[in-house]
Interface confidence: medium
């Protein structure tokens, strides 16, 4: 399946980046799994993943840096706690788990840029 | 002439962005003019410009937001005072002014991303 996501997103000065991951579904999937992968220096690592039932809330693990909501074939993803060293290509992977047939789609990635804030001066 | 510059640069949290603009010269130009143009929403505006003699310092106007140094066919440009609204494509234009023949080269642009910092909390 085709997965689309923005090419570039800037994290806020608080280290929060949000983007929409949209997929074209050939049918009425009831169970969908969304995974965010990070590619940097040709290494790919899993950032977070969530499986959700269509119409229900998207729930990541409690210790996940990701949160999200779903609306139809769109998933609104938010990644928090980002620092400059986390700058990289964040790829959205969508799997239509149920009912069969199984479909897999991978986006081209969203380049997330993160700038560390200057520390505030100490208050005397 | 061919002008190369990085495709993306992040401004620091202090609103400072630096990049190198490099040009291929067919001969020994003694007088070179460098102009930084900003393209946003299909509008192109001049950010700053400086003419320099090879081997001498690159001097912008006193009220310019740009500073720079030159080394051979490389110009190291720094733009200061940037805010989020200044995010855009910054294009390096190089003119070999003297001696003839005159050559003009325009780079593909550097996308500068600027994120406004969070204000520091007031000290009580």
């Amino acid at each position: 399946i085709q997965v689309t996501q923005p090419s570039v997103v800037l994290a806020s000065s608080r280290g929060i980046a949000s983007f929409v991951c949209e997929y074209a579904s050939p049918g009425k999937a009831t169970e969908v799994r969304v995974t965010v992968l990070r590619q940097a220096d040709s290494q790919v690592t899993e950032v977070c993943a969530a499986t959700y039932m269509m119409g229900n809330e998207l729930t990541f693990l409690d210790d996940s840096i990701c949160t999200g909501t779903s609306s139809g074939n769109q998933v609104n993803l938010t990644i928090q706690g980002l620092r400059a060293m986390d700058t990289g290509l964040y790829i959205c992977k969508v799997e239509l788990m149920y009912p069969p047939p199984y479909y897999l789609g991978i986006g081209n990635g969203t380049q997330i840029y993160v700038i560390d804030p200057e520390p505030c001066p100490d208050s005397d | 002439i061919q002008v190369t510059q990085p495709s993306v640069v992040l401004a620091s949290s202090r609103g400072i962005a630096s990049f190198v603009c490099e040009y291929a010269s067919p001969g020994k130009a003694t007088e070179v003019r460098v102009t930084v143009l900003r393209q946003a929403d299909s509008q192109v505006t001049e950010v700053c410009a400086a003419t320099y003699m090879m081997g001498n310092e690159l001097t912008f106007l006193d009220d310019s937001i740009c500073t720079g140094t030159s080394s051979g066919n490389q110009v190291n440009l720094t733009i200061q005072g940037l805010r989020a609204m200044d995010t855009g494509l910054y294009i390096c234009k190089v003119e070999l002014m003297y001696p003839p023949p005159y050559y003009l080269g325009i780079g593909n642009g550097t996308q500068i991303y600027v994120i406004d910092p969070e204000p520091c909390p007031d000290s009580d």
Partner: antibody, heavy 125, light 107 residues
């Protein structure tokens, strides 16, 4: 319209000097360069040198010691002088307007966009 | 100095055919290349500048391509008036050397 016309001596003795004048119309020598090119009988083209709008010159490295190019802007004339002629300097000599072309917003490109009809020079005793 | 190597030196073709002439520079000339046509007993005429741009009045059956050190001139559906000698010339810093030329003859 742009026109260039060369006028030369036709026959020159070996070791002597060659002087050719190029008279132009339809453009100003204060705005454009003018190149000299020669072509020996039955052979290819050889770029000799150029004089720019401000009087600056560039020469073919093999001819730098023998070649002088100058001009008189008010008369719209450019002069080529080649010293110490040998038989292999026998050629048709052309002058050509040297234009910087601009396309897109990217580059200044050069070309010899208008040529004179050429003047034939034979070096012989 | 930059050397220009042009090939082939000569070409015998029929009207209506398509021909390609190539020019190789000894170093990168950044598309600063022109093509000229010269007919017997006449002065050269500019055909293409900046490697790909047709000069004013040049028919669209002519096209230039290339970058870096490799360039070519293509003539589609040759007409009788296209026969003559073709020269390339680099204009990337003086001296502005010409290629050796390609003589296009009617078969």
């Amino acid at each position: 319209q742009v026109q260039l016309k060369e006028s030369g001596p036709g026959l020159v003795a070996p070791s002597q000097s060659l002087s050719i004048t190029c008279t132009v119309s339809g453009f100003s020598l204060t705005s454009y360069g003018l190149s000299w090119v020669r072509q020996p009988p039955g052979k290819g083209l050889e770029w000799l040198g150029v004089i720019w709008y401000d009087g600056n010159t560039n020469f073919h490295s093999a001819l730098i010691s023998r070649l002088t190019i100058s001009k008189d802007n008010s008369k719209s004339q450019v002069f080529l002088e080649l010293n110490s002629l040998q038989t292999d300097d026998t050629a048709t000599y052309y002058c050509a307007k040297t234009e910087g072309h601009y396309y897109g917003s990217n580059y200044g490109y050069y070309a010899l966009d208008y040529w004179g009809q050429g003047t034939s020079v034979t070096v012989s005793s | 100095d930059i050397q220009m190597t042009q090939s082939p030196a000569s070409l015998s073709v029929s009207v209506g055919e398509t021909v390609t002439i190539t020019c190789r520079a000894s170093e990168n000339i950044y598309s600063n290349l022109a093509w000229y046509q010269q007919k017997q007993g006449k002065s050269p005429q500019l055909l293409v500048y900046a490697a790909t741009n047709l000069a004013d009045g040049v028919p669209s059956r002519f096209s230039g391509s290339g970058s870096g050190t490799q360039y070519s001139l293509k003539i589609n559906s040759l007409q009788s008036e296209d026969f003559g000698t073709y020269f390339c010339q680099h204009l990337w810093g003086t001296p502005y050397t010409f290629g050796g030329g390609t003589k296009l003859e009617i078969k």
